[in-house]
Interface confidence: low
């Protein structure tokens, strides 16, 4: 019967002679050279050669366990004289023994990962892994231990798992956003003489809302003409926020001040500016300066950072209303309505007009009155300027026939003495009435109660 032990062969042999594997031997072999040993199977005659007389097997080439860990061969023992086998052909195995000839290799040369800024110490960031081609079942050649070569004190790595975690409290993206961590994987359980590989992990801190908005100045001043219609933008204010994205979004609001109901603030979503706009009609003569308290706040707040203080800031906005030169107008109404008797005489005073100018009278207002040019010629009435900011409407003829013309519309131009001259046109409605002999009105046409502006023929 065959006599042999398991054959083992160390990989990566560097000696100059062939590497001795072992000896095939039959108990029928009397040592007289009558038996011939023959080898067949994986690598026989090429990788493995046999001394046909002694059964000694040698390896002719350097073998790599990671390429092929096991060779299966067959042995025969032949009687040289008869040519017949003295043993049944038998299969045997040459097992290649591992040496530590492979360094750990990471699955990626570069890893990228993100972790929120201000994370608690020990927050999971990323897991790296390295594989070692050596034999994991024998020795520590494939036992990989991870360590951090670059990236402390910010990050740590678990030696067995390759899990990278945060190692420093209050890592602030606004201070530093990018970290390059270098991780080493070393075999032999990290012991001296182990082989190693490294990988780079690019870690980005992602933003959390840990910064409130801040106005760069405590007071802003804008001016706007009193004629600005509602909706007019009069100025922009901008708070800055060190965060990014939705954490840097800002909402503006007016929280206090005399102008609370006179102005609005809207948020420009693109620029994150607050636009102060006119809400109600302004009047320089009533109020010239408004003070507002404007607040900038983050709409999305993380409760865990509220201890840092309120996520809002406020600034004072001073708005100066600018005067616009306004024309004089009738004092008591947009139009005057007056009456004339059918039997009136010429040059009778039927109405006194009063005018006012909203502008501040720096040197006293002086108004002049006249009929509009289109009504002045051939009019049935005249206007008499009293030079005291009043004027009288006078009849120009004897008698009026209310059946011919029941209502007259007089366009009166009132001008001031400013430079440039400002003027407005007011309408005086004159209704013709039947009167008794004392001049008391008895009847007037009702349609005169509603009258258009403009000019009726014959005025």
């Amino acid at each position: 019967s065959w006599m042999w032990n398991q054959f083992f062969l160390l990989e990566e042999y560097t000696g100059s002679d062939y590497q001795y594997v072992g000896k095939l031997h039959s108990d029928q072999d009397r040592g007289d050279g009558s038996l011939k040993y023959i080898l067949s199977g994986d690598g026989a005659g090429d990788l493995f050669i046999i001394n046909e007389n002694t059964g000694d097997i040698q390896a002719t080439k350097r073998l790599d366990r990671e390429e092929k860990p096991v060779y299966i061969l067959r042995a025969q023992a032949i009687n040289r004289r008869t040519g017949r086998p003295v043993e049944p052909e038998s299969e045997f195995i040459i097992k290649i023994h591992d040496i530590n000839d492979n360094e750990p290799i990471f699955t990626k040369e570069v890893y990228t990962a993100t972790v929120p800024e201000m994370s608690d110490v020990g927050t999971f960031v990323v897991q790296v892994t390295a594989t070692d081609a050596d034999d994991p079942t024998y020795g520590n050649s494939a036992k990989v231990v991870y360590s951090i070569l670059q990236g402390q004190p910010y990050f740590s790595v678990e030696s067995e798992t390759g899990i990278i975690k945060t190692a420093l409290l209050n890592m602030d993206r606004e201070n530093r956003e990018q970290y390059q961590v270098v991780i080493q994987a070393k075999d032999m359980g990290g012991q001296m003489g182990g082989l190693s590989g490294t990988t780079t992990v690019n870690i980005t801190l992602t933003d959390v809302n840990d910064n409130p908005p801040r106005f760069p100045q405590s007071t802003y001043q804008f001016k706007t003409p009193e004629s600005s219609p509602p909706g007019t933008p009069i100025g922009r204010i901008k708070a800055s926020d060190a965060d990014v994205g939705e954490n840097a979004e800002i909402e503006y609001s007016i929280t206090d001040g005399e102008g609370l109901d006179m102005f609005d603030v809207i948020t420009d979503q693109e620029t994150q500016e607050g636009i102060i706009t006119v809400k109600k009609l302004l009047d320089f003569e009533k109020k010239k300066v408004y003070t507002l308290k404007v607040e900038a706040s983050n709409p999305y707040v993380e409760p865990r950072f509220l201890y840092l203080g309120p996520f809002k800031d406020s600034a004072t906005v001073r708005i100066v209303v600018e005067d616009v030169d306004e024309p004089p107008v009738f004092e008591f109404a947009e139009f005057y309505e007056t009456f004339v008797c059918e039997k009136a005489k010429a040059d009778q005073l039927i109405q006194t007009l009063h005018a006012v100018d909203k502008d501040d009278p720096y040197s006293g207002h002086q108004f002049s009155f006249s009929l509009a040019p289109e009504a002045a010629s051939g009019s049935n009435f005249t206007i008499q300027d009293n030079k005291d900011n009043t004027a009288g409407i006078l009849t120009r003829k004897n008698g009026y026939n209310r059946h011919e013309m029941s209502t007259y519309l007089l366009p009166v131009v009132i001008s001031d003495n400013d430079y440039p001259v400002q003027s407005s046109t007011g309408t005086v409605t004159v209704r013709v009435c039947a009167c008794d002999h004392h001049g008391n009105m008895q009847s007037c046409h009702a349609e005169a109660l509603i009258h258009p502006t403009g000019l009726s023929t014959g005025a």
Epitope: K108, Y111, A113, T114, P116, V125, V126, Q127, T161, I163
Partner: antibody, heavy 122, light 106 residues
Amino acid sequence: EVQLVQSGAEVKKPGASVKVSCKASGYTFTRNFMHWVRQAPGQGLEWMGWIYPGDGETEYNQKFQGRVTITADRSTSTAYMELSSLRSEDTAVYFCARGVYGGFAGGYFDFWGQGTLVTVSS
Amino acid sequence: DIQMTQSPSSLSASVGDRVTITCKASQNIYKNLAWYQQKPGKAPKLLIYDANTLQTGVPSRFSGSGSGSDFTLTISSLQPEDFATYFCQQYYSGWAFGQGTKVEIK
């Protein structure tokens, strides 16, 4: 070859508990996150939680907090998901899924179990 | 929590068609997005991760693109075995899936 083999279908009454197992092979069990995801009939996928078998750390979806418990037995490379106080809306296929190496917080899922149908009915 | 919105919810297409499915995140998730394919009665299968990296063994007719909050899965030439439901999934903050897009035969 990575394989995740789950336990068979279960029928439970409302108020009862169910424990689904997921046996892993073909990789080092302790070195990957194991996630549980469920899918109600004709519906989308809903993440339930994970366990890191290396140290037993877990994280659960707030929706299931207090009702779900994920455990792992390192000696048999098996992960378990137990859901208690069952109600009819818990009728679903429950999957275990391996979280890959790398990526933020365990990343995406590269291998999935075949799924376990849990029917909750009175 | 981050919400994922997939569109369309279903589509009909023929073999050889180019098919595009979109997925929108409710906030910036950078490139932390995966796409899965699921056939009836089966577990989901990973197609694409990190928004545009093809999983080993997945045919090159599948591709992913996008970053931030808008992502796209494209099948360049639909094959008979591609009729299935497709899900997107974010893994930037927690894990959330889109509601799925069913690709049916026209």
